[in-house]
Amino acid sequence: MADNFSLHDALSGSGNPNPQGWPGAWGNQPAGAGGYPGASYPGAYPGQAPPGAYPGQAPPGAYPGAPGAYPGAPAPGVYPGPPSGPGAYPSSGQPSATGAYPATGPYGAPAGPLIVPYNLPLPGGVVPRMLITILGTVKPNANRIALDFQRGNDVAFHFNPRFNENNRRVIVCNTKLDNNWGREERQSVFPFESGKPFKIQVLVEPDHFKVAVNDAHLLQYNHRVKKLNEISKLGISGDIDLTSASYTMI
């Protein structure tokens, strides 16, 4: 599942090798001056944005009980606001009634501590160049995390980090069709730690999902459900404090 492709490779020929909202390439690489707000700063894990870089971000500790990840998530009740400066994410809005994805974004969850399992509707399904970003913190004593991209009752893409499967940590990916799980794809690289913040990014490509964690490429998963426009919900569950879940087009 893992590969060495960069986002630059994936998008070369698209006319936009350095799309807005991403580092210069897929993975944990430094951003240039004034670039994507993912350059590390002292005290953060690599790739974490400095305070204020995410749109609408409040100062650290903006709401009580907020997970330690991404200091100062937007204040409760607001969607991310306009860009904070050059290189920030594009300005925010809600998807149009037609389900189209204009270049503005990100769309999705209200700010503040979200309740898992969390349901993120994806109106109109997923499309290539759609980027889903999930921020949170792994709870203590965690057993599992799961992302479920759903097409009706089918699970098009199940991404399932397991913290203790026979005393091993493993990420299992699979698809469920007509209530039957398919062949598992397993990944032993495991970037999650109990009690630690994380950022999961899922990039939809024409023939696969790409997953990066904490700005480092992790794996890709070839589409087994081909009708991408019918993958209309993302479920987020497991032993996490969920800070935000959103999507945008890049």
């Epitope: 209200p110 309740i115 399992p117 349901n119 709870k139 799961a146």
Partner: antibody, heavy 122, light 107 residues
Framework: QVQLKQSGAELVRPGASVKLSCKAS????????INWVKQRPGQGLEWIAR????????DYNEKFKGRATLTAEKSSSTAYMQLSSLTSEDSAVYFC???????????????WGHGTTLTVSS | DILMTQSPSSMSVSLGDTVSITCHAS??????MGWLQQKPGKSFKGLIY???NLEDGVPSRFSGSGSGADYSLTISSLESEDFADYYC?????????FGSGTKLEIK
Amino acid sequence: QVQLKQSGAELVRPGASVKLSCKASGYTFTDYYINWVKQRPGQGLEWIARIYPGTGNTDYNEKFKGRATLTAEKSSSTAYMQLSSLTSEDSAVYFCARFAYYYGSGGYFDYWGHGTTLTVSS
Amino acid sequence: DILMTQSPSSMSVSLGDTVSITCHASQGINSNMGWLQQKPGKSFKGLIYHATNLEDGVPSRFSGSGSGADYSLTISSLESEDFADYYCVQYAQFPPTFGSGTKLEIK
């Protein structure tokens, strides 16, 4: 069939503590969170906290943090809520309710206990 | 906290009628909401989750709709056992919050 059986009514003095129980049956205890919800006449419903019995991890309403303590005993499929420093404002009916741990198959506040009436009075 | 504004607070209806109850959230909740029923002197029962999905065993005369911040519960062809209190609940953001309830009474 799914059942959440709660402990009986309690009459306690102001300043005291009380521990309420909720015994689950008819389903796998670790497939759901157990939530605790307060209902006072004319005051509506108020969520207190929840526990995931599989790990013991909890989430609390800020309003009850420090006064409510949730625990769960997997061996007996029983969840507990201890409320401390009680005042007359805590007089209410307290319900336990289950809530899905896994995404995708329902079970969102679907089954509730019958409630425990707590009266705080001197 | 997210405020769930439920209306009406009560309604008198007849057997066989179709009724709708609405809930407005103070911000978008991405269909992370449900509907509950409480019969007089009894406990609660979940009817609908994720705005539109029926919980197991719930009759098909119950249906839910809505998105964003506005949601509704519709009961078609009311039966005698449907006269009860109904509550919406959001579970998008901590803490979960409930509507103030709608009492369905027999006309």
